[in-house]
Structure formats: C-alpha cells, structure tokens
Amino acid sequence: QDSTSDLIPAPPLSKVPLQQNFQDNQFQGKWYVVGLAGNAILREDKDPQKMYATIYELKEDKSYNVTSVLFRKKKCDYWIRTFVPGCQPGEFTLGNIKSYPGLTSYLVRVVSTNYNQHAMVFFKKVSQNREYFKITLYGRTKELTSELKENFIRFSKSLGLPENHIVFPVPIDQCIDG
C-alpha cells in the first residue's frame, strides 16, 4: 500500500455512476476481487496482490452482512462488517462506524453490475483526516474477460488513478474457495 503523504484526491461523486434499479437480493453471495484500484493501492515490483473473496448476505433490515476472507500470516483471515443502506438503492454506509478508531466517514456505491458475472464498486472513506478511495472489480468467478478488465482500467483512470494504482490480484489456492 502507498504510504506516502501525497494521496491522489478522491473524485467528486458526480464522476461515479450508480447502478440504476439496484437489486439488493441479486447482489448477495460470493464475489471474487478480480481487480483493485485506489489511491492507497500500489503495484509492487515483486509479488502481486493476492485475490480475496467478499460475501454479501442480506439481513432482514436490508443491511448487508459483509465478510471478506483473505490469506494473511499463513492462515485465513475473516473481516466482517455491516453495510447500511444509504440515500439511494446501491449506496451504503458503514454500520457502527464509531467502533473503527479514526474513521469518520465511509461510503459504498455500486457503480455497475449484472449480478451473475461482474460488478464494479466504489468505496470512499475518511480515516485519520485523510481521504481514501478505491474501486473493486468483482467477479462471480476468478477470471473475467479482457474487455471487462479494460473497462475497469478505463473507469479507474477516469477517476484520476494512474496505471500503477490499478492491480489485478492473482488467484490463490488458499482460503478463497472455502
């Protein structure tokens, strides 16, 4: 991750589309993180970013229980949080934000999805008074077409991110297929 003090500024939300007529029930289930871009994401010269999976489960109150599973320190690490519906369908905020030290705002916006194959999701947060943003390219499978990946690159660049802030995590044998 980028540890320098100069973060690329977050784009105005007017540059970030919202999936029209978002269907929260269809978005449920496992998504693989096939692409990842952001102002704190940086392509390394050595090993690539490892793929992780995120599972969205709809609760009765229409919030999502969101669980990410990743390989860390030689074991599977589970990161659980709640996404609470925001102002419009397909937009969310982080539940119980006060329990995250230094975090003052957190926005999730589903940019586009066809539910059964791919999705692009925009995240923006303010932590320790610094504004971070990222875009994930989700896939229901670990591989997506070159066309979808190139569209993700174009969109990420349109938000001000250069190529070295856009990565495609490598699928791994551990954790993500559980």
Epitope: R43, E44, D45, K46, D47, P48, Q49, K50, F71, R72, K74, K142, E143, T145, S146, E147, K149, E150, V167, F168, P169, V170, P171, I172, D173, Q174
Partner: antibody, heavy 119, light 107 residues
Amino acid sequence: EVKLQESGPGLVAPSQSLSITCTISGFSLTSYGIHWLRQPPGKDLEWLVVIWGDGSTTSNSALKSRLSISKDNSKSQVFFKMSGLQTDDTAIYYCARHRYSDYHAMDYWGPGTSVTVSS
Amino acid sequence: DIVLTQTTSSLSVSLGDRVTINCRASQDISNYLNWYQEKPDGTVKLLIYFTSRLHSGVPSRFSGSGSGTDYSLTITNLEQEDIATYFCQQGNTLPWTFGGGTKLEIK
C-alpha cells in the same frame, strides 16, 4: 548475484513421486515468489505452480491434485513434489523467480534438472 | 487454456540484421505478454515484460510491441550473442502459458 539451482533424482519409476529442491541465493524468499515449470521433450514449456513470498500458492488447475509445494525461508529452499508420475512427465523441470507483480514475468531461472520417468 | 503460437520455429539470420519474431494468442491477452531468451547452454533470461517494457540490463536493441492477440519481438542490429531461442509467455489468464519458441540460426 541472484542464483537458482534445482536438484532432483534424475530417474523416477512410474507411479512414484518426484521431489525437487530449488536452492536460491542473492534474494529472500519472503519477498519473491518461486515458480515451477517443465519442458517435456519436443513440447512447449508448461507452468506448474508458484509459491508466493507470503507462503500462499497458485497452481495449474489441470495438475493441482498431483502437486505439492512448500519452502523454508531461512534455508533459502523451495520444495516441489509431484505424485503419480507417468512417462509423459519426463521433462526438464525449472524453478524461476517471479517479477513485476501482476504482469507475471519470471526474471531469473535455474538451469533446470532433467527427470526421466521409466521403469 | 490460452494457446500462444510462434509460427516460425526457426529463422536464418545474419549478424547486423533486424529480426522480428511473432507470437499470436488464441484470445485477447491485454498486453500481458512477456519475452524470454534461451541460450544454447540452456540459460533462460527475461527480456521484455508487459509487451514492450525492457527488463533491467537488457540491451536497447531489443524491443516489443503488439496488442490484443498479436505481439512481436524485434532485435535491431543482431549480434552474435543474440543467437538463441526466443519464446513468449502470457500472464493474463491462468494457467500462464508459453509459445513454442523461435530459434535463430546463422545463415
């Protein structure tokens, strides 16, 4: 100076397992992934598996059930094992260092070790 | 699996030539194409990654180009030490695959 060196048995009987060690120098296994590849006589190179700096692995799904890979960072060694060998597993086996993140290139290669499967 | 085809398996060349070696992928690989050199003694070296980026220490007479499914490696002003086999590799889609190689031979 970066170096990789494979050491293998040379000859393996059919249905037996193959074990090869890749010993590296000039860099750390905690920072770089190590790939295993092979080239059967008269055929293209075939990528088999990689073990990443953090110990996670990525395998060729066609061979995944037969492959095992591990490493000892402190000894600078990577261990490759393949089970159920048949004659068409006869090949030169290479280890190589991963480079350039998700561009998935391999910048340094060992000289290879020849493996013949025969009774 | 993505198939990489190097249609020319051997090429007769003269020192000083400009040599182009081609590699065609069975589907779009979005520039995730790397080139390697294998010397007669079996030593393998990375030359170019991501279609056109020169690996450190590689002479500037080597260059790469291409997009989509068609890629090429060019050596300008061929030198004796360049007599070797050259092969391509795609890093776009698992499993990562290799071309069959193009061997340069002196006329």
